[in-house]
């Protein structure tokens, strides 16, 4: 697991941004913009919402999501879960890496009250080449996208 | 354009801390302590609230602000916006990099209730030599400064 | 204080995770898992809740804690303080490094309301060999542990 940064290689890094297509409503992970605006990929890959590791090592992975609403949608759980999850070719289930639970709706005492909240996650995990990291938000109906600055997902090798 | 970390160079990094002079009330960005206590600059510069990049590259930039109040000030917007913005001499507008919106006042159901909240932002962006990054909070009246540990601003090259 | 990353050395990094034994109720810092699951130590050491620095340098240190409850326990302060603190052999008191204050209980308008909140801290600090960093949460009764993904503590040299 000893990881050395070779001088002729770039240090893997990425910052992916929220876009209109991020929220699929399909129960899958959030999708991200990889090339436009502030988004970039350097020494990492992307596939169907996932950052794909090309070089094994320890990575600081992070995500922020902007939450907001007017009161709370009917049927909305009082808990919002925002997490970073790992998919690996050798294991059938996603593995939780970093997770937060919040109750932002509880702030709005009236059903017509506008509220905003933000959830940030970041931490160091070991990732093997070919492993994938995705972002999930339950309930994603409360994620508020705009211009890629409020909801995002990134990583860099440490 | 490939950026490699050369082993004989220090890696640019900085951590700036909140101080009594941070809040100007002028509509400008927050100002920061760069030398005292926990604050430092290494391979980055500072000017009028801005971290100034001296070496182009990808940087993880971050900021935390401590918010608090007793109820909500009259005329206070229900949304607090905390953001990291880029300034450059050759571009007329500030560019949003990372932004959060929160409604912390909504937590206080009574007008005399004391409340606290914190907003953290962090992400990787590409910065050119000479470009500046600043922190803005709207409404800055709710930022609570103390000793440099609760509100801060930093960056390091990845 | 000039710090160079030598190419033949591993870059110090660690990620420690919350466990059933994390909350001691003794007024001491939180304790952490260092070896199981997602937890690891690489070029850093651990002792009684503290990350112990073995190589002097600038480190990005971070912690997240998951808070939650049903209403608010009697006698609970309305403010929760989550902080990263430094212990050094040459100084008798802990030094605050990065701190957040939150009022998550204020979200729950009824005493039987379930609420969740999360606090994230991260920033760059200079640490000498032998210095220790710990996490404290006041009141720790509101920290919700599960599987190491919701409350954690880590660092890496920048």
């Amino acid at each position: 697991l000893i990881q050395e940064r070779r001088s002729h290689e770039v240090n893997p890094a990425a910052h992916l941004t929220g876009a209109n297509s991020s929220l699929t409503g399909s129960g899958g992970p959030l999708l991200w913009e990889t090339q436009l605006g502030l988004a970039f990929l350097r020494g990492l890959s992307y596939h169907d919402g996932a950052l794909v590791v090309t070089k094994a090592g320890y990575y600081y992975i992070y995500s922020k999501v902007q939450l907001g609403g007017v009161g709370c949608p009917l049927g909305l759980a009082s808990t919002i879960t925002h997490g970073l999850y790992k998919r690996t070719p050798r294991y059938p289930e996603e593995l939780e890496l970093l997770v937060s639970q919040q109750s932002p709706c509880g702030r709005a005492t009236s059903s017509s009250r506008v509220w905003w909240d933000s959830s940030f996650l970041g931490g160091v995990v070991h990732l093997e080449a070919g492993e994938k990291v995705v972002v999930r938000v339950l309930d994603e109906r409360l994620v508020r996208l705009r211009d890629g600055t409020r909801s995002y997902f990134g990583a860099f090798m440490v | 354009l490939i950026q490699e970390r050369r082993s004989h160079e220090v890696n640019p990094a900085a951590h700036l801390t909140g101080a009594n002079s941070s809040l100007t009330g002028s509509g400008g960005p927050l100002l920061w302590e760069t030398q005292l206590g926990l604050a430092f600059l290494r391979g980055l510069s500072y000017h009028d609230g801005a971290l100034v990049v001296t070496k182009a590259g990808y940087y993880y930039i971050y900021s935390k602000v401590q918010l608090g109040g007793v109820g909500c000030p009259l005329g206070l917007a229900s949304t607090i916006t905390h953001g990291l913005y880029k300034r450059t001499p050759r571009y007329p507008e500030e560019l949003e990099l990372l932004v959060s919106q929160q409604s912390p006042c909504g937590r206080a159901t009574s007008s005399s209730r004391v409340w606290w909240d914190s907003s953290f932002l962090g992400g990787v962006v590409h910065l050119e030599a000479g470009e500046k990054v600043v922190v803005r909070v709207l409404d800055e009246r709710l930022v609570r400064l103390r000793d440099g540990t609760r509100s801060y601003f930093g960056a390091f090259m990845v | 204080l000039i710090q160079e990353r030598r190419s033949h050395e591993v870059n110090p990094a660690a990620h420690l995770t919350g466990a059933n034994s994390s909350l001691t109720g003794s007024g001491g810092p939180l304790l952490w898992e260092t070896q199981l699951g997602l937890a690891f130590l690489r070029g850093l050491s651990y002792h009684d809740g503290a990350l112990v620095v073995t190589k002097a340098g600038y480190y990005y240190i971070y912690s997240k804690v998951q808070l939650g409850g049903v209403g608010c326990p009697l006698g609970l302060a309305s403010t929760i303080t989550h902080g990263l603190y430094k212990r050094t052999p040459r100084y008798p008191e802990e030094l605050e490094l990065l701190v957040s204050q939150q009022s998550p209980c204020g979200r729950a308008t009824s005493s039987s309301r379930v609420w969740w909140d999360s606090s994230f801290l991260g920033g760059v600090v200079h640490l000498e060999a032998g210095e220790k960093v710990v996490v404290r949460v006041l009141d720790e009764r509101l920290v919700r542990l599960r599987d190491g993904t919701r409350s954690y503590f880590g660092a890496f040299m920048v």
């Epitope: 893997p12 090339q35 436009l36 | - | -």
Partner: antibody, heavy 118, light 107 residues
């Protein structure tokens, strides 16, 4: 230094297919996307699509999506762009270009002239 | 799609003169605008990225400015080797698009 070397000129008949190659050197091939851009004689530049060399993921301009296929062979650090059902207005110089992470292009191949003529 | 319209289409300029080429976007593209130079029978060459950012190895006489929908490439003191066609490109929305080009000729 980064180099992108493309295959030689091709002459094709309408309805045929052409496959242009782009061999990369001077960097780790899987680290950056490869884009394809074309330029008809005396005309401007037109984006065709890109490929992620690591996993073969692609994004195509809607205008070409029914006719273009981008592939790669990581063992020889080479990307390919195949255009099928060629028409005379596909006559152009086809360029591969490499990003530095986002959608702008500091590195370009020398271009491959594809002539479609009956 | 975002349409980029350059003006003028053609410019004949004497050496040492200042050259200004504009690029107008059909909708706001923030600062996500890049400039390329292409000489006859050569590949395009990146001159400026993100509206104003200079590129290593590109002479300092080339500069960029603008924001939102209106952008400018300036060549401060034209040299004979600058005879070429110049293109703008946006990276704000898919599909990526280029301007139609501005040909600069030396008088």
């Amino acid at each position: 230094q980064v180099q992108l070397v493309q295959s030689g000129a091709e002459v094709k008949k309408p309805g045929a297919s052409v496959k242009v190659s782009c061999k990369a050197s001077g960097y780790t091939f899987t680290d950056y996307y490869i884009y394809w851009v074309r330029q008809a004689p005396g005309q401007g530049l037109e984006w065709i699509g890109y490929i992620d060399p690591y996993n073969g993921g692609t994004k195509y301009n809607q205008k070409f999506k029914d006719r273009v296929t981008m592939t790669r062979d990581t063992s020889i650090s080479t990307a390919y762009m195949e255009l099928s059902r060629l028409r005379s207005d596909d006559t152009a110089v086809y360029y591969c270009a490499r990003t530095s992470g986002s959608s702008w292009f500091p590195y370009w191949g020398q271009g491959t002239l594809v002539t479609v003529s009956s | 799609e975002i349409v980029l319209t350059q003006s003028p289409d053609f410019q004949s300029v004497t050496p040492k003169e200042k050259v200004t080429i504009t690029c107008r976007a059909s909708q706001s593209i923030s600062n996500n605008l890049h400039w390329y130079q292409q000489k006859p029978d050569q590949s395009p060459k990146l001159l400026i990225k993100y509206t104003y950012q200079s590129i290593s190895g590109v002479p300092s006489r080339f500069s960029g400015s603008g924001s939102g929908t209106d952008f400018t490439l300036t060549i401060n003191s034209l040299e004979a080797e600058d005879a070429a066609t110049y293109y703008c490109q946006q990276s704000n929305r898919w599909p990526l698009t280029f301007g139609q080009g501005t040909k600069v000729e030396i008088k």
